[in-house]
């Protein structure tokens, strides 16, 4: 049994048939020593009486908030909670493998330029009684300040019967130079709590290989004199690191037709202009990637060619 | 990624280009070796990231750009101490911290280029002859630190007397190769900068 | 989703005693309490007996305290009500449940899983 955070305590379970469980001592935080009681999760039911309380705990019913009281006083709490381990691997149920870029992947992390700012985001299926709390550090064995948000909720999708949930959390390095060489992996540890089921997530990058930029901005077309062809131009998107001349981008330009079959012409260019050919319905598409280091392509930015 | 590329222009920074062609020849050996040694953990999630040039050059510092400077945390540690003359300066007024950037790159590539061959001499006595250096890539570090023309003494090629042990070696370049990728990307950033500049 | 499938109901003389069992499959490692609730017919289905988790706390109205015990052999996954000193008001049908939910362990509301029910007729 460990301490997640004041009052709150999480009891490890090998998980099989006849599992002995864990046998847990509580003690009432009071200098008092007589005719203490106490209850869980809110029913009026004495489950015994004393300064300690001794309950085995063999599953997650064995849980909740035990509370000691004297007199109708509320004296301390105890939120006990379960991590589940089963054949030796701790339970992932609350949140979903994306299995990208490879299976067990519940966490993932983006970030759009060098400043030490991430994202991470995560999904699940749970609807109530569900809330995270995120830690992030630079390196694990002499962690370097990453300072996170609060996760929210931020956005809801509906998968078949299901209804899926992302949410995701914002992070900042204390002290991140955007020049700097990484040499320890940002490591960032989810804590999961649905009801009383306790399990930790954790992720593991260099802020180089979760790169990926905004789309290009301010895109447009100059058609030429007497010809098919238009001059495309764009500029770095504004989120990305300064100088550009320093953290420079390599773009591709693509021109796809109206119909996903039509064969797309692709253009690859270190500039920020590129001459093509336009055809009629056709859309003219750009997006970026760091010019010397191939994390992820933006996402597109596209205009008509009409 | 396999894009074409557009040469660069005759009368642009001459390190440039042997810069682009480090970095393409860096990355082209170090997805060879993790190819190669697919049952070795050499995937950038399985090894110690180690710097050979760790307290021995500052290229970062050095080469950090003007409009950086400013980031409290990109100036822990600037060193002063290089040595200020070399051919990719001399059509252009260039600053001290501009001679301590690109003489710092140069002993980078010095430091990789001695600890490459050593390893390459321990691969070619492999029974199993799995992997080698590309000689493409020892060319190319060559050839920038020609362009980059600093006079500095030559470092001895270092040599064991004792049986190589191939696993660790093997190991070693992993570690070596991604540590020279991110080095190599450092650089052509660099380049890059001055080039606008 | 946890299935549950009671037995041992029947036609007994008041005073005596029946143990009813109910089996639980599926995802049953999810669930904070199991119960046993009864519906005379016109009534409303009112609570007898819910065992927290492997029996850290057990709770019963004051209608049967000390009449009806309530156990679990979590190895089995199975849990038992014991009534003895049965009345004619004890007829009824009985049904287990089991529920997720931390609160409110006596409200029938709040469980999410229901077995089919078995009849228990108290009569001379």
């Known amino acids: 049994i460990w301490e997640l955070k004041k009052d709150v305590y999480v009891v490890e379970l090998d998980w099989y048939p006849d599992a002995p469980g864990e046998m847990v001592v509580l003690t009432c935080d009071t200098p008092e020593e007589d005719g203490i009681t106490w209850t869980l999760d809110q029913s009026s039911e004495v489950l015994g009486s004393g300064k300690t309380l001794t309950i085995q705990v063999k599953e997650f019913g064995d849980a909740g908030q035990y509370t000691c009281h004297k007199g109708g006083e509320v004296l301390s709490h105890s939120l006990l909670l379960l991590h589940k381990k089963e054949d030796g691997i701790w339970s992932t149920d609350i949140l979903k493998d994306q299995k990208e870029p490879k299976n067990k992947t519940f966490l993932r992390c983006e970030a759009k330029n060098y400043s030490g700012r991430f994202t991470c985001w995560w999904l699940t299926t749970i609807s109530t009684d569900l809330t995270f709390s995120v830690k992030s550090s630079r390196g694990s064995s002499d962690p370097q300040g990453v300072t996170c948000g609060a996760a929210t909720l931020s956005a809801e999708r509906v998968r078949g019967d299901n209804k899926e949930y992302e949410y995701s959390v914002e992070c900042q390095e204390d002290s991140a130079c955007p020049a700097a060489e990484e040499s320890l992996p940002i490591e960032v540890m989810v804590d999961a709590v649905h009801k009383l089921k306790y399990e930790n997530y954790t992720s593991s990058f260099f802020i180089r290989d979760i790169i990926k930029p905004d789309p290009p901005k301010n895109l447009q077309l100059k058609p030429l004199k007497n010809s098919r062809q238009v001059e495309v131009s764009w500029e770095y998107p504004d989120t990305w690191s300064t100088p550009h001349s320093y953290f420079s981008l390599t773009f591709c330009v693509q021109v796809q037709g109206k119909s996903k079959r039509e064969k797309k012409d692709r253009v690859f260019t270190d500039k920020t202009s590129a001459t093509v050919i336009c055809r009629k319905n056709a859309s003219i598409s750009v997006r970026a990637q760091d010019r010397y280091y191939s994390s992820s392509w933006s996402e597109w930015a596209s205009v008509p060619c009409s | 990624r396999n894009l074409p590329v557009a040469t660069p222009d005759p009368g642009m920074f001459p390190c440039l280009h042997h810069s682009q062609n480090l970095l393409r020849a860096v990355s082209n050996m170090l997805q060879k070796a993790r190819q190669t040694l697919e049952f070795y953990p050499c995937t950038s999630e399985e090894i110690d990231h180690e710097d050979i040039t760790k307290d021995k050059t500052s290229t970062v510092e050095a080469c950090l750009p003007l409009e950086l400077t400013k980031n409290e945390s990109c100036l822990n540690s600037r060193e002063t101490s290089f040595i200020t003359n070399g051919s990719c300066l001399a059509s252009r007024k260039t600053s001290f911290m501009m001679a301590l950037c690109l003489s710092s790159i140069y002993e980078d590539l010095k430091m990789y280029q001695v600890e490459f061959k050593t390893m390459n001499a321990k691969l070619l006595m492999d029974p199993k002859r799995q992997i080698f250096l590309d000689q493409n890539m020892l060319a190319v570090i060559d050839e920038l630190m020609q362009a980059l023309n600093f006079n500095s003494e030559t470092v001895p090629q270092k040599s064991s007397l004792e049986e190589p042990d191939f696993y660790k070696t093997k190991i070693k370049l992993c570690i070596l190769l991604h540590a020279f990728r991110i080095r190599a990307v450092t650089i052509d950033r660099v380049m890059s900068y001055l080039n606008a500049s | 989703e946890v299935q549950l499938v009671e037995s041992g109901g029947g036609l007994v003389q008041p005073g005596g005693s029946l143990r009813l069992s109910c089996a639980a499959s599926?995802?049953?490692?999810?669930?904070?309490?199991m119960g046993w609730f009864r519906q005379a017919p016109g009534k409303e289905r009112e609570f007898v007996a819910v065992?927290?988790?492997?029996?850290?706390?057990?709770y019963y109205p004051e209608s049967v305290k000390g009449r009806f015990t309530i156990s679990k052999d979590s190895s089995k996954n199975t849990v038992y009500l014991q009534m003895n000193s049965l009345r004619a008001e004890d007829t009824a049908v009985y049904y287990c449940?089991?529920?997720?939910?931390?609160?409110?362990?006596?409200?029938?509301?709040?469980?999410?899983?229901w077995g089919q029910g078995t009849q228990v007729t108290v009569s001379s």
């Open positions: 065992i927290r988790g492997s029996g850290v706390a057990t």
């Open positions: 599926g995802r049953t490692f999810e669930t904070i309490a």
């Open positions: 449940a089991a529920t997720t939910n931390r609160f409110k362990n006596t409200d029938y509301t709040t469980y999410d899983y």
